[in-house]
């Protein structure tokens, strides 16, 4: 695979990561070099504490901070360095589980891989040029910091600490692949890969924003749908000290403090679910694009891949409208999502609707980004549900979903697909955090009439639920499209926050496939036991935990 140069062997004989590891990156006064030391140093450029509780709770926890007395570029690079340093074993195992053979030595689609490599190289080169031409731009400053953080992560993992001044290169098939996992779903189609990661109709997350009666609270919940091989999870807390621009005169950015659900070696969420110090909670579910005519908009120049635009918007925005304005610039048409931006600063507990700003919805497809304030809708219906189907009619139509409704029926419709109906039926049962966890983990496919698939044999289908369990579909069944097949895929977590929890940068989180109404997932007893799942527990029976930041 494309594991950065020295490959997986470097100092990884012991793959059992320590329960806790604390490291700092120092700027050595005498040599001028960055260096790693154990513990938290008062004058460190960056420091991180990784607590590995994967076997106990299904999560590892990363607490990472940087020091504002150093310039942003140094902070960003050092943040990457220290993250890789404390989580190198987890990074190795996650890479092996998910990416090791992607465009690797045994890849038979060499043509696609060459196209992908070329696309990424041109795109990275274009961004470097833009960064040079727009050195005073807050946007391009944040893009540069994001890429520097990735560079630090990769350098550190490879056992090299060389802070880049001026231009720097990112390997297109190195740890960039871990960042672009979402973008790849669309790049594969845009670049004509024959066997794509994406199954037709495959869901990629459920989410709900629920206004409790009397507006006594506003709960935000997200359930990631992913391959089970991705279940090495880290909840990350970043406390950065970046400025809006490269000079010291610039003010600090709004989103320096953030907590998010993530993966080893990934410097953003990917789920996506963020609690930001700016008072925003940002989350998405993937809507994809089923219209081949739109792939022409996916070009390596003039676009910034979604993972970077996501990071930049989270850092710079103070409200939903600004977040959308930042995010929609340089639309790549990759990782096409419905984004929900909740602004808790605008929410009045026990109060009336402020009319706007509490909820902003953004939908992206190639060549198009549509944004609307949906605060009034939220207060009228008391919830906003998201389930991988575009809300905006123009996006729904342009992305080719009408054809799929014509071909397969209501499963692809916005109002009548199984999750839309389950959310509509059950959202009123949410009255607190625990009932919200129950809803976002809900899967009672064997007994719920809304989980039936009329064209399937058997009819009950584990994909047709808020938290899918596609491993439970029979292998020998008959299904109209791939998403309904048996596969090692489903809802792999839950994250829920509230007005008061978000203020404290906290959440309730559970890791692993749902087992509320179903037998728990166990690798050794599953049809997928031979798949790589290094570092993962065998049996997934974890309860929700309150994220334990000190």
């Amino acid at each position: 695979g494309a594991l950065p140069t020295q490959g997986p062997g470097r100092r990884r004989q012991n793959l059992d990561p320590p329960v806790s590891r604390v490291r700092s990156v120092l700027l050595d006064a005498a040599s001028g070099q960055l260096r790693l030391v154990d513990g938290i140093h008062p004058y460190a450029v960056a420091w991180a504490n990784l607590t590995n509780a994967i076997r106990e709770t299904g999560w590892a926890y990363l607490d990472l901070g940087t020091n504002g007395s150093y310039n942003d570029s140094l902070q960003a690079y050092a943040a990457g360095v220290v993250e890789a340093s404390v989580s190198e074993e987890l990074i190795y195992m996650h890479w092996m589980n998910t990416m090791v053979n992607y465009c690797g030595p045994f890849e038979y689609e060499v043509g696609y891989c060459e196209k992908l490599k070329s696309f990424l190289e041109i795109n990275l080169e274009w961004m470097q040029r833009e960064m040079e031409l727009s050195q005073d731009s807050p946007y391009w400053h944040q893009v540069r910091l994001t890429l520097l953080q990735l560079k630090g992560l990769e350098d550190s993992y490879e056992g090299r600490l060389t802070f880049p001044t001026g231009r720097f290169t990112i390997k297109p098939l190195g740890f960039l692949l871990l960042q672009i996992a979402g973008d790849l779903e669309d790049l594969e189609q845009a670049l004509n890969k024959t066997s794509t990661k994406l199954s037709l109709g495959s869901g990629s997350c459920s989410a709900i924003i629920k206004l409790l009666p009397g507006a006594r609270d506003l709960l935000v919940a997200h359930n990631t749908w992913n391959s089970y091989q991705n279940m090495l999870r880290i909840i990350k807390k970043y406390q950065l000290q970046f400025r809006q621009g490269p000079q010291e005169a610039y003010p600090l950015i709004a989103g320096n403090n953030l907590v998010f659900s993530s993966y080893p070696g990934t410097i953003f969420s990917g789920d996506d679910f963020y609690i930001l110090g700016s008072g925003l909670v940002t989350l998405e579910t993937t809507i994809g694009n089923k219209n081949p005519a739109l792939w022409k908009y996916v070009q390596p120049q003039g676009c910034v891949l979604e993972w970077i635009r996501n990071i930049v918007a989270n850092r710079l925005a103070l409200d939903g409208a600004t977040w959308a304005d930042i995010f929609k610039q340089f639309n790549s048409g990759t990782y096409n999502n419905q984004w929900m931006i909740v602004d808790y600063k605008a929410f009045i507990p026990n109060g009336p609707s402020p009319g706007s700003r509490v909820l902003t919805i953004l939908e992206q497809i190639p060549g198009m980004v549509v944004v609307a304030d949906k605060t009034e809708d939220l207060y009228k219906t008391t919830y906003w549900a998201s389930y991988n189907i575009p809300f905006f009619e123009i996006v729904f139509n342009a992305s080719g979903l009408q054809d799929l409704v014509a071909q397969y029926g209501d499963w692809f419709s916005y109002t009548k697909n199984p999750r839309a109906q389950i959310f509509q039926r059950d959202q009123s049962l949410v009255e607190d955090m625990n009932s919200m966890v129950r809803l976002i983990r809900y899967n009672n496919f064997l007994h719920d009439p809304l989980s039936l698939c009329e064209a399937c044999i058997p009819k009950p289908n584990a994909e047709n639920a808020i938290s899918a369990r596609s491993d439970l579909n029979p292998a020998n069944g008959s299904y109209p499209f791939q998403a309904l097949y048996q596969r090692p895929h489903g809802g792999i977590d839950v994250k829920v926050t509230s007005f008061s929890l978000a203020k404290r940068m906290s959440m309730l989180a559970a890791s692993g496939p749902t087992w509320d109404q179903l037998p728990p997932f166990q690798w050794s007893l599953s049809p997928f036991r031979s798949m790589l799942h290094m570092g993962q527990p065998d049996l997934w029976t974890f309860s929700p935990i309150s994220v334990p930041w000190d």
Partner: antibody
Framework: EVKLEESGGGLVQPGGSTKLSCAAS????????MDWVRQCPEKGLEWVAE??????????YYAESVKGRFTISRDDSKSCVYLQMNSLRAEDTGIYYC?????????WGQGTSVTVSS | DIVMTQSQKFMSTSVGDRVSVTCKAS??????VAWYQQKPGQSPKALIF???YRFSGVPDRFTGSGSGTDFTLTISNVQSEDLAEYFC?????????FGSGTKLELK
């Protein structure tokens, strides 16, 4: 538990050579910057040389008084750091300590004595 | 080279006293100063780094202060086991340099 153990000291003729070794354990050696410090009655504690980690290209730094005569090196696979001392002089006599430079020289070995005399 | 001057070679003290060992750098070394304790026949032991931060396990009666060129190691409530030689060291520039030491003795 961090341990540093020096060896290789002894009596050496002026102009002669010797190689000091330091075996380390209890920490991730390849990440560590390692130093040699000597202590002689007349000069007190005197920093001799440093070698940075593999990640920092194993860069070496020397005191002016030993430059060109002493060479610091490391073998990460053995968790050892070495000090090759050539063209030894009487003023090189002293106890040589191997140290790990964490925040500063946070761990020291027990030292090995080098005497340069005819 | 930066010269670290410990002007007092010896200091007399009694158990329970408070004593301050001083060290002066010939140029600005920011807070890149460490203090070490050495007992006869033993190797030096690190007490303080970055001028004022104690290493773990070092009793809180040891306090470091200063920045720039003037640095102090204070031992409050001196114990008999504190009778030793104390060295300051700068690691702001190569070559790293040590003070000549201050020996703490009983009155």
């Amino acid at each position: 538990e961090v341990k540093l153990e020096e060896s290789g000291g002894g009596l050496v003729q002026p102009g002669g050579s010797t190689k000091l070794s330091c075996a380390a354990s209890g920490f991730t050696f390849s990440d560590a910057w390692m130093d040699w410090v000597r202590q002689c009655p007349e000069k007190g504690l005197e920093w001799v040389a440093e070698i940075s980690s593999k990640a920092n290209n194993r860069a070496t730094y020397y005191a002016e008084s030993v430059k060109g005569r002493f060479t610091i090196s490391r073998d990460d696979s053995k968790s050892c750091v070495y000090l090759q001392m050539n063209s030894l002089r009487a003023e090189d006599t002293g106890i040589y300590y191997c140290t790990r430079r964490g925040y500063t020289m946070d761990y020291w070995g027990q030292g090995t004595s080098v005497t340069v005399s005819s | 080279d930066i010269v670290m001057t410990q002007s007092q070679k010896f200091m007399s003290t009694s158990v329970g006293d408070r004593v301050s060992v001083t060290c002066k750098a010939s140029q600005n070394v920011d807070t890149n100063v460490a203090w070490y304790q050495q007992k006869p026949g033993q190797s030096p032991k690190a007490l303080i780094f970055s001028a004022s931060y104690r290493f773990s396990g070092v009793p809180d009666r040891f306090t470091g202060s200063g920045s720039g060129t003037d640095f102090t190691l204070t031992i409050s409530n001196v114990q008999s086991e504190d009778l030793a030689e104390y060295f300051c060291q700068q690691y702001n520039n190569f070559p790293f340099t040590f003070g000549s030491g201050t020996k703490l003795e009983l009155k």
